[in-house]
Amino acid sequence: EVEKTACPSGKKAREIDESLIFYKKWELEACVDAALLATQMDRVNAIPFTYEQLDVLKHKLDELYPQGYPESVIQHLGYLFLKMSPEDIRKWNVTSLETLKALLEVNKGHEMSPQVATLIDRFVKGRGQLDKDTLDTLTAFYPGYLCSLSPEELSSVPPSSIWAVRPQDLDTCDPRQLDVLYPKARLAFQNMNGSEYFVKIQSFLGGAPTEDLKALSQQNVSMDLATFMKLRTDAVLPLTVAEVQKLLGPHVEGLKAEERHRPVRDWILRQRQDDLDTLGLGLQGGIPNGYLVLDLSMQEALS
C-alpha cells in the first residue's frame, strides 16, 4: 500500500503517457487521477511500466471501481490484466468477444493462468452459452481448452478449430471427448494425403471406430504402441491379427510388453491362438484350436 502524499508541484498528470514511467510509486499514487487513468487505459499497454508501478495503477482503479471494473475499462487493461486476481475478475461482467480477445492476447504464448480460466468462466456464464465464435476464439488461443469442455459443449466446435490442436493438447481428453472430436478431425483433415493425414489424425484416434482403423491398416501407417494403447477397446476388439499387424507395422513387437494391459489384453482374448502364433511374439491367452467362438452380443440382437 502506497502512502497518501501530496503531489509535488508541476507533476500532476494531465494525460497517461510515457513520462509517467519516471514517477516513483508514491508520485503515481498522488499525481495520477483514477478517472483519467480509466478513460486512457488503452495507453498503458505501450508504456514500459514496472511490475510495481502497475500495482499502483491497479490500486487506483480498485478504489474507483470497488464493485468491479466496467467493460469499457476491462477491454483496455492490457498488461494490467496480469495484476488481476481471480477474485477481482469474478466481479466483472464481460460480454463482448472483443474484450475476451484483447485480454487473451495479453497472455498469448503463456500457459492458461487462473486469471484466464476465471475470465473465460465469467465470459461464458455472462453469454449464457458457448457459441461457435467463442469456441473459435478460445481454441485459437488455448487448443488444450477443448479437453475441459463436456461432450455436449464440444459438439459445437467447428472442424476448422481442430487445425490449431497440438497432440499434447489432447492429453487430458477422455474417450467421450475424443468420440466427439475425432469425426471433426477426420473432416478437417480429409483432403490430406495418406502419411500427412495420419500424422494429423493420430492424436484423435482414441475416438476412431473399427472401420476407420481397418482402413488405416491398409495404408502402411506404422502406428506406434502409445497410440494403439489409447484406442477404444470396442474399436480394437473386432480387428483381426493380420489387420493389427498391418496397422502397427514394425511396432507390432511391442504387443508383447503390453499383453496384460487394455486394449491388448482384451483383444488377445478374442483372437485364435493359431493366428496369434503367426506373429511369433509368444502372445498367450487366445482361443484354443477347435473351439467355436460365439458372439453373444450378436445372438442377443437377433433374438
Epitope: 510515457e18 505501450a46 514500459p48 511500466f49 514496472t50 502497475l54 494490467l80 496480469l82
Partner: nanobody, 117 residues
Framework: QVQPVESGGGLVQPGGSLRLSCVVS????????MAWYRQASGKERESVAF????????LYLDSVRGRFTISRDIDKKTVYLQMDNLKPEDTGVYYC??????????WGQGTQVTVSS
C-alpha cells in the same frame, strides 16, 4: 518471453563514461517501446530513459537528462545507453526492458555500474 541481456557496466571514476548495451533476442523487437532502469541497493527500481518503438520519442529522468543518451538499433535488436559525466548517485544495477517484459516482471541479470573515486 526472452529475457534481455545487458552488458557494458563497470567501475568508473566520477566524470567518466560508459556505454551499456541490451540485446533482446527472440522477441518482436520492433513492436515494443524500450526503457533503461536502474536499482540502487535497497532502493526502488527506477526508469532512467525511454525510447519509443520507432525511436522518435525519447525521454529521460530529470537527474540524467543531458548526461545520458538512449538509442536503439533495430537490425541488431539492441538498445544502448551512453552514460557521460557519471556521478556517484548513478551507481546501481542497470536493466533494460519492454512493456511486456516489465509487466510480467521478467528481467535480465542487469549490469552493475559503480561510480567511485
Amino acid at each position: 518471453q526472452v529475457q534481455p541481456v545487458e552488458s557494458g557496466g563497470g567501475l568508473v571514476q566520477p566524470g567518466g563514461s560508459l556505454r551499456l548495451s541490451c540485446v533482446v533476442s527472440g522477441s518482436d523487437f520492433t513492436e515494443d517501446a524500450m526503457a533503461w532502469y536502474r536499482q540502487a541497493s535497497g532502493k526502488e527500481r527506477e526508469s532512467v530513459a525511454f525510447v519509443s518503438k520507432d525511436g522518435k520519442r525519447i525521454l529521460y529522468l530529470d537527474s540524467v537528462r543531458g548526461r545520458f543518451t538512449i538509442s536503439r538499433d533495430i537490425d541488431k535488436k539492441t538498445v544502448y545507453l551512453q552514460m557521460d559525466n557519471l556521478k556517484p548517485e548513478d551507481t546501481g544495477v542497470y536493466y533494460c526492458n519492454s512493456a511486456p517484459g516489465a509487466a510480467r516482471n521478467y528481467w535480465g541479470q542487469g549490469t552493475q555500474v559503480t561510480v567511485s573515486s
